[in-house]
């Protein structure tokens, strides 16, 4: 899977969208690795 900064950000956006935004506050692009997905 793509793990560039842009890919990580888009993947996290999709995850937040699907979860309705109900995730931890520190779950942000710069504080997660590709393994978080």
């Amino acid at each position: 899977a793509c793990d560039t900064a842009t890919c990580v950000t888009h993947r996290l956006a999709g995850l937040l969208s699907r979860s309705g935004g109900v995730v931890k506050n520190n779950f942000v692009p710069t504080n997660v690795g590709s393994k978080a997905f």
Partner: antibody
Framework: EVQLVQSGAEVKKPGASVKVSCKAS????????MNWVRQAPGQRLEWIGV????????TYNRKFKGRATLTVDKSASTAYMELSSLRSEDTAVYYC????????????WGQGTTVTVSS | DIQMTQSPSSLSASVGDRVTITCKAS??????VAWYQQKPGKSPKALIY???YRYSGVPSRFSGSGSGTDFTLTISSLQPEDVATYHC?????????FGQGTKLEIK
């Protein structure tokens, strides 16, 4: 309102260095990566590198590795791009850009900083 | 590095026309492609991400498609304010790379 406000135009001599700043506001600066891109006259956009403002970790386009240095001042929500050993081919508009999720899912760009390298 | 080849490099079309710009990657980049619009003297403005998703606020006449190596940006009905240069970008691999741009003019 999200804003990326860059420093003003610079004129430099060949061999000198330039440091461009990008002041972020309207979002949590350390949550999102900051990219730097340049556009020389009549040329395609060219990616310089990216910095994680939370950790300071950088990834560079190898074309610029050793000449470009990306840094941040977290307390000032400001990113910096320094380019050394300038040559005429470095004459370009330099942009900072950050892809955000919050407050709005959008790819924001600074207004650009013109760097002219001339003897 | 991945080469992104855009075509055409310039085109002229009439208001209301359907306009298609293509971008070919030198290797498979999945759907990790963005499209930007740049007006003279301005910063690029993001239109499309992940090959086919429009950012909020981007008019619905702009659409993107493609995967792998072949990508397309379509303007379904050209408007005067669409005069600009359009850039594709792959972000699947470092370094991110851009197409050479397509300059769009009104006939």
């Amino acid at each position: 309102e999200v804003q990326l406000v860059q420093s003003g135009a610079e004129v430099k001599k060949p061999g000198a260095s330039v440091k461009v700043s990008c002041k972020a506001s309207g979002y949590t600066f350390t949550d999102y990566y900051m990219n730097w891109v340049r556009q020389a006259p009549g040329q395609r956009l060219e990616w310089i590198g990216v910095i994680n403002p939370y950790s300071g970790r950088t990834t560079y386009n190898r074309k610029f590795k050793g000449r470009a240095t990306l840094t941040v001042d977290k307390s000032a929500s400001t990113a910096y791009m320094e380019l050394s050993s300038l040559r005429s081919e470095d004459t370009a508009v330099y942009y900072c850009a950050s892809l955000l999720i919050r407050p709005h899912y959008f790819d924001y760009w600074g207004q650009g900083t013109t760097v002219t390298v001339s003897s | 590095d991945i080469q992104m080849t855009q075509s055409p490099s310039s085109l002229s079309a009439s208001v209301g026309d359907r306009v298609t710009i293509t971008c070919k990657a030198s290797q498979n980049v999945g759907t990790n492609v963005a499209w930007y619009q740049q007006k003279p003297g301005k910063s690029p403005k993001a239109l499309i991400y992940s090959a086919s998703y429009r950012y909020s606020g981007v008019p619905s006449r702009f659409s993107g498609s493609g995967s792998g190596t072949d990508f397309t940006l379509t303007i379904s009905s050209l408007q005067p304010e669409d005069v600009a240069t359009y850039h594709c970008q792959q972000y699947n691999f470092y370094p991110y790379t851009f197409g050479q741009g397509t300059k769009l003019e009104i006939k």
